[in-house]
Interface confidence: medium
């Protein structure tokens, strides 16, 4: 039975040209995290494997930095980066947990962070 929950940064916004940290946290389970995948709509951004470390997708090598922790830093933001991002936690023995973050990249200098929320 999957008892865990994914807490994410929820809906966030950032300025064009800036950077943003995508962060998820798995709680309420003792399952072992074996791998975390970061995806953007139909593309893979990066993988963090418990044994092997980080794999950054070649398409994003220049703009994605691993961390902090199991999170991901997205740099040199453009308006095209606006959209949904997913953290996929592979765990043993529970299985897979998925969290969703919506990022809006703004032209203006006003970028407020949304509230945190949870996805079971």
């Amino acid at each position: 039975m999957m008892t865990g929950t994914i807490e994410t940064t929820g809906n966030i916004s950032a300025e064009k040209g800036g950077s943003i940290i995508l962060q998820c946290h798995l709680s309420s389970t003792t399952a072992q995290v074996t791998q975390v995948n970061w995806e953007q709509q139909d593309q893979l951004l990066a993988i963090c494997n418990a044994d092997l470390g980080w794999h950054i997708s070649p398409s994003f090598k220049d703009r994605v930095a691993p961390g902090p922790g199991l999170g991901l830093t997205l740099q040199s933001l453009t308006v095209n980066d606006t959209g949904e991002y997913f953290c996929i936690y592979h765990t043993y023995p529970d299985g897979t947990y998925t969290g969703r973050i919506f990022l809006e990249v703004l032209e203006s200098s006003v970028a407020e962070h949304g509230a945190r929320f949870q996805i079971p």
Epitope: E39, Q43, L52, S57, S59, K61
Partner: antibody, heavy 118, light 107 residues
Framework: QLQLQESGPGLVKPSETLSLTCTVS??????????WGWIRQPPGKGLEWIGY???????YYNPSLKSRVTISVDTSKNQFSLKLSSVTAADTAVYYC??????????WGQGNLVTVSS | EIVLTQSPGTLSLSPGERATLSCRAS???????LAWYQQKPGQAPRLLIY???SRATGIPDRFSGSGSGTDFTLTISRLEPEDFAVYYC????????FGQGTKLEIK
């Protein structure tokens, strides 16, 4: 345990397009655990990575072959495919499909020998 | 592109002996990104070692991997008849490349 099986013609004419399909069993091709890749081996020679696809459709190809390669995935059939255009005799090889964890290739098909000849 | 050079090209040994195969990279490779495969005639390669030193599932403990940076080694502590095959190293940097292979043959 994953099992992979290549299928496709064993003979292709020069300048035509080589097409191969890999059927995955024992697991879902939609798993975010894996990349699905193609590797080839000319007779008596070493291994050359061709490219891979992620289940969401993003691809990455060997730069030396990129202009001629297309890899696609059909999640409904649990298959992924390779197309290599404008083939020459130098493309004669055993073509393997394989699953990749992103760092290494852990499960392989048995291989499909494709000969390019008129 | 990272080039992997394996040596020797052919290694002739007898069952029961120790085999040491070398893989040298043209530039530094993260240990996480180095793997070894065994290939027998007419068969697909089989993953032996990943992450430079971790044995894949079902691989006997006579196989071990070591090394870092540009120099990596596959060691077979005591050769069994079924170990005679071709061995390839492989790295993942921004793309996958394989070494040219070492043929391990019976002396």
């Amino acid at each position: 345990q994953l099992q992979l099986q290549e299928s496709g013609p064993g003979l292709v004419k020069p300048s035509e397009t080589l097409s191969l399909t890999c059927t995955v069993s024992g697991g879902s091709i939609s798993s975010s655990r894996y990349f699905w890749g193609w590797i080839r081996q000319p007779p008596g020679k070493g291994l050359e990575w061709i490219g891979y696809i992620y289940y969401r459709g993003s691809t990455y190809y060997n730069p030396s072959l990129k202009s001629r390669v297309t890899i696609s995935v059909d999640t409904s059939k649990n298959q992924f495919s390779l197309k290599l255009s404008s083939v020459t005799a130098a493309d004669t090889a055993v073509y393997y499909c394989a699953s990749s964890s992103a760092w290494y290739f852990d499960y392989w098909g048995q291989g499909n020998l494709v000969t390019v000849s008129s | 592109e990272i080039v992997l050079t394996q040596s020797p090209g052919t290694l002739s040994l007898s069952p029961g002996e120790r085999a040491t195969l070398s893989c040298r990279a043209s530039q530094s490779v993260s240990s996480s990104y180095l793997a070894w495969y065994q290939q027998k005639p007419g068969q697909a390669p089989r993953l032996l070692i990943y992450g430079a030193s971790s044995r894949a599932t079902g691989i006997p403990d006579r196989f071990s991997g070591s090394g870092s940076g540009t120099d990596f080694t596959l060691t077979i502590s005591r050769l069994e008849p079924e170990d005679f095959a071709v061995y390839y190293c492989q790295q993942y940097g921004s793309l996958y490349t394989f070494g040219q292979g070492t043929k391990l043959e019976i002396k």
